[in-house]
Every structure is written in structure tokens, then in C-alpha cells.
Interface confidence: low
């Protein structure tokens, strides 16, 4: 069956729903699970055969203001001898997340949801070879 | 990031913090980017630490479909196509923000929720603990 989108539902609307002006939605930005922690293996970004660095991007008109982006350190992958092997490729793994964007229009402030593509880390892949006919 | 200067004629009500509750436009910017990782790349098959993608569906959430990665092997695939257990396939996890319908089933009322997803896998050198 069709997956309901934001603003559309196949559920019966309960009486307790807050009134919302047309064309907009109410968003509580007090985050559920705010204090949960990522329990990733230690230092995987430097132990990986496709290592990466982290860069923090900061924007005061975005919520959350800090978004961490990964960047692959090499184009190739690190082999057993610790050297870059360019017969393999380090590639970014990306994931979408939502942010709230604050926009100033004259004296009024409006808020917009935005999908942001975050690079999470890198993985080592066998390259696709295009053979010329 | 740049703070956009306000019109000097505006009342001085600039708040650097976001309010707890905001009214947001129903149209999500960049909404139509491809959310199916199987369609966007085949890294999950070509990686030396390949993974399977599992569909996680929740109609009370936006986006309602999230793909979770699960590493196929404990080790990594070597040049001969065999699993090398001297290396480890590990998941790369990321906290993302989604919308949770609150109160439940309401069409236009949401709360931000932080969830942890495994996005893919990477091949790492294992941490070896030597017994004294």
C-alpha cells in the first residue's frame, strides 16, 4: 500500500490534533532521544582501508547548527603495506537527514524543513571499468 | 554560516536560539532527492565490506521508509573474492533527524526525533588486545 507522506495520512484524524494553518505544520524541535550516543567501533575512520576525516559545518540559521561531514582521505584504498592502491576506490557513503532552516524575509522569520545529504564515512569498492568498444 | 542581517527598522526581537515549537512550510526543500540507496549506488555490492539493505517502515514517521545496512561478513573480501578474517567489516552508523507524528496519527503535527541508522559498512584493521 501507498506510504503516507508528510501532511497526508490514511489514519482517522483524532480529535486531539492541534489546529494548524493551511499549508504548514506544527513542529516541536525538542528532540526525542536527544541524548542517545553512537556506539561505533573505536577510530574506524583511521583504521579503515578507506579512511576519512571529519569536518564540522556550522550555520546559525540551521537547526541543528552543527552538521558533521566526512571526507575520504584517498581516492584509492590502503593496502596491507599501508600504501594507497589506486586499483581500488575509496567512496563516500551518504545518508539523508532533516534540518530546520530559519529564513528572514523582511521583518518576519519563517521556518522550512530541508533534506540534507550527509557523508557518513567511506568504504572501499572495486571500480567500475568502462571498456571502450 | 552567516547570520543574515535584519532590517534595521524591525523590532529588536532577534533570538539566536530556535523556538521550541515552530510552524514550518509543508513543502520540504530537496524533498525529491533519491532515498533508495539500492537505486542511488551499488557500493553495497562492490565494497570489500559488502552489506545488505533492510527496509524499515513506520507510517508514524517521516520519512516512513529508512534503509538499514547489515554487514554480510565478519571479515572483508580480498582480491581473490574470499573472506579475509584478518580484517573486519564494521557498520558505519549515523544519527539522523526524522519527524515523528505527535500526537500519534495527526497529519500535520510532528516532533523531531533522533534515530541511529547503519548506513553502510567499511573494512578496518582489527584492534588486537594482547594478553599479558
Amino acid at each position: 500500500r501507498k506510504i503516507p507522506k508528510v501532511g497526508h495520512t490514511f489514519f482517522q484524524k483524532p480529535e486531539s490534533c492541534p489546529p494548524v494553518p493551511g499549508g504548514s505544520m506544527k513542529l516541536d524541535i525538542g528532540i526525542i532521544n536527544e541524548n542517545q550516543r553512537v556506539s561505533m567501533s573505536r577510530n574506524i575512520e583511521s583504521r579503515s582501508t578507506s579512511p576519512w576525516n571529519y569536518t564540522v559545518t556550522w550555520d546559525p540559521n540551521r537547526y541543528p547548527s552543527e552538521v558533521v561531514q566526512a571526507q575520504c582521505r584517498n581516492l584509492g584504498c590502503i593496502n596491507a603495506q599501508g600504501k594507497e592502491d589506486i586499483s581500488m576506490n575509496s567512496v563516500p557513503i551518504q545518508q539523508e537527514t532533516l534540518v530546520v532552516r530559519r529564513k528572514h524575509q523582511g521583518c518576519s522569520v519563517s521556518f522550512q524543513l530541508e533534506k540534507v545529504l550527509v557523508t557518513v564515512g567511506c568504504t572501499c569498492v572495486t571500480p567500475v571499468i568502462h571498456h571502450v568498444q | 554560516g552567516i547570520t543574515i542581517p535584519r532590517n534595521p527598522g524591525c523590532p529588536n526581537s532577534e533570538d539566536k536560539n530556535f523556538p521550541r515549537t515552530v510552524m514550518v512550510n509543508l513543502n520540504i526543500h530537496n524533498r525529491n532527492t533519491n532515498t533508495n540507496p539500492k537505486r542511488s549506488s551499488d557500493y553495497y555490492n562492490r565494497s570489500t565490506s559488502p552489506w545488505n539493505l533492510h527496509r524499515n517502515e513506520d507510517p508514524e514517521r517521516y520519512p516512513s521508509v529508512i534503509w538499514e545496512a547489515k554487514c554480510r561478513h565478519l571479515g572483508c573480501i580480498n582480491a581473490d573474492g574470499n573472506v579475509d578474517y584478518h580484517m573486519n567489516s564494521v557498520p558505519i552508523q549515523q544519527e539522523i533527524l526524522v519527524l515523528r507524528r505527535e500526537p500519534p496519527h495527526c497529519p500535520n503535527s510532528f516532533r523531531l526525533e533522533k534515530i541511529l541508522v547503519s548506513v553502510g559498512c567499511t573494512c578496518v584493521t582489527p584492534i588486537v588486545h594482547h594478553v599479558a
Epitope: 576525516n53 569536518t55 571526507q71 581516492l75 571500480p127 | -
Partner: antibody, heavy 124, light 111 residues
């Protein structure tokens, strides 16, 4: 907007010194490796030097080794090129350029942002 | 003496495909990926391609690259008048311990 602005060029006599500066803005300068590249009038591009994001590693072209020194002040978002014992063949437009990815990169992602250049003329 | 060799010039009419070769050695192209730069007269160089055929944003997909052994090439398909510029290949050279540029190729759009 990411910008690099070179300064310090001018006319100088052979054997003298000059210090070029490159002011960076619009990005986290301390995260990126930086290069100097020069171009003699009517000639091609010639690489001069590179410095790692934290200043710990420096590499030079053979033609300037021992005479030029690349350095950076991350607190001032500024890259420098100290040029000593200048020769007529050092006459060129000098560009500073940013490495295209943060961290331990020197070249893999290319030089993605360039300044407009500053002209150095070595003549008696 | 540049470590990377390019033809001094190449030309084509609008819509045609032009290829520029870049020849090196094991210590540079043989070991590292090649970057390509475009420089229009009077302006600073601009990064055109890097890595394994990756394009910075804003660079049209008419530009493509290939790399094999100790040589690389840049192809410009559907040639346009704004493609008239100097093109440089560049990469790291292990022997020199530094970045090295090709000698440059001037592309002329005829007609």
C-alpha cells in the same frame, strides 16, 4: 564565499627578498593543505610549494628549494611565501590555491580554489 | 622540463570532440590520479576534473577523462566557444616529491 587574496608582489632586484601573503576566507583554513603555483609571462603553470593543513609537512619544487619558504598562520587564516635570493627566472604571477579536501591531502582532490594572483618582477 | 607532456595545441569546430593527451611516467601518472585544469586568458586556473573522473560542481559532463598506465587524456565533447582555453594536467610525482603540471594545451574553437 570561499576566497583567496594574494598580496606582496612587486618589482625587486636580483638577489633581494620578497614575502607574499595569501589571505583566506569563507572556509576553515586550518583544515586544508595549501599550495603556491606560479606562471611566468606567456608560459605554463609551475608548481612552487605545498604545506599541510597544520604546517607540519612542506614540499618544494627543485627550482626554489633552499631559497623559498612556505609557511602559514592558522590563527590569521594566512598563507605565506618567503622568497630569498630572487632570480630573473622567478618573474611570474604567483597564485595561492587550496586543496580540494580537508585533512592529509596534497593533491588527490585537486586545487579547487585559486586566488587571482600577485605579480613578482625580478629585474635590475 | 615538465614531468608531464601535453601537445601544445588542439582544435575543433563547435560540436566536435577534442582530446588532449597527458603523458608521464611510473612515478607520477603511473602511481597517482590526474587532475585537470582550465585557464582562460587573463584569469586564474580552474579545477576541471580530479580523481577517477570526478567533476567539481558546475563543470559540465561534456568533459570526461581516462587514465591508463602512464598516460591520461581529457575529452571535450560538443565543443563550445567558451571551451577555448589552456588546459593543464597535473598530479603528484614521487621522484620529485611534489606536484607537477603538464606543459599545457591551447584549445582553439574554429569557425
Amino acid at each position: 564565499e570561499v576566497q583567496l587574496l594574494e598580496s606582496g608582489g612587486g618589482v625587486v632586484q636580483p638577489g633581494r627578498s620578497l614575502r607574499l601573503s595569501c589571505a583566506a576566507s569563507g572556509f576553515i583554513f586550518s583544515n586544508y593543505g595549501m599550495h603556491w603555483v606560479r606562471q611566468a609571462p606567456g608560459k605554463g603553470l609551475e608548481w612552487v610549494a605545498v604545506i599541510s593543513y597544520d604546517g607540519s609537512n612542506k614540499y618544494y619544487a627543485d627550482s626554489v628549494k633552499g631559497r623559498f619558504t612556505i609557511s602559514r598562520d592558522n590563527s590569521k587564516n594566512t598563507l605565506y611565501l618567503e622568497m630569498n635570493s630572487l632570480r630573473p627566472e622567478d618573474t611570474a604571477v604567483y597564485y595561492c590555491a587550496k586543496v580540494g579536501a580537508s585533512g592529509d591531502y596534497y593533491y588527490s582532490y585537486g586545487l579547487d580554489v585559486w586566488g587571482q594572483g600577485t605579480t613578482v618582477t625580478v629585474s635590475s | 622540463q615538465s614531468g608531464l607532456t601535453q601537445p601544445p595545441s588542439a582544435s575543433g569546430t563547435p560540436g566536435q570532440t577534442v582530446s588532449i593527451s597527458c603523458s608521464g611516467s611510473n612515478s607520477n601518472i603511473g602511481s597517482h590520479s590526474v587532475n585537470w585544469y582550465q585557464q582562460v586568458p587573463g584569469a586564474a586556473p580552474k579545477l576541471l576534473m580530479y580523481g577517477i573522473g570526478q567533476r567539481p560542481s558546475g563543470v559540465p559532463d561534456r568533459f570526461s577523462v581516462s587514465q591508463s598506465g602512464t598516460s591520461a587524456s581529457l575529452a571535450i565533447s560538443g565543443l563550445q566557444s567558451e571551451d577555448e582555453a589552456d588546459y593543464y594536467c597535473a598530479t603528484w610525482d614521487d621522484s620529485l616529491g611534489g606536484y607537477v603540471f603538464g606543459s599545457g594545451t591551447k584549445v582553439t574553437v574554429l569557425g
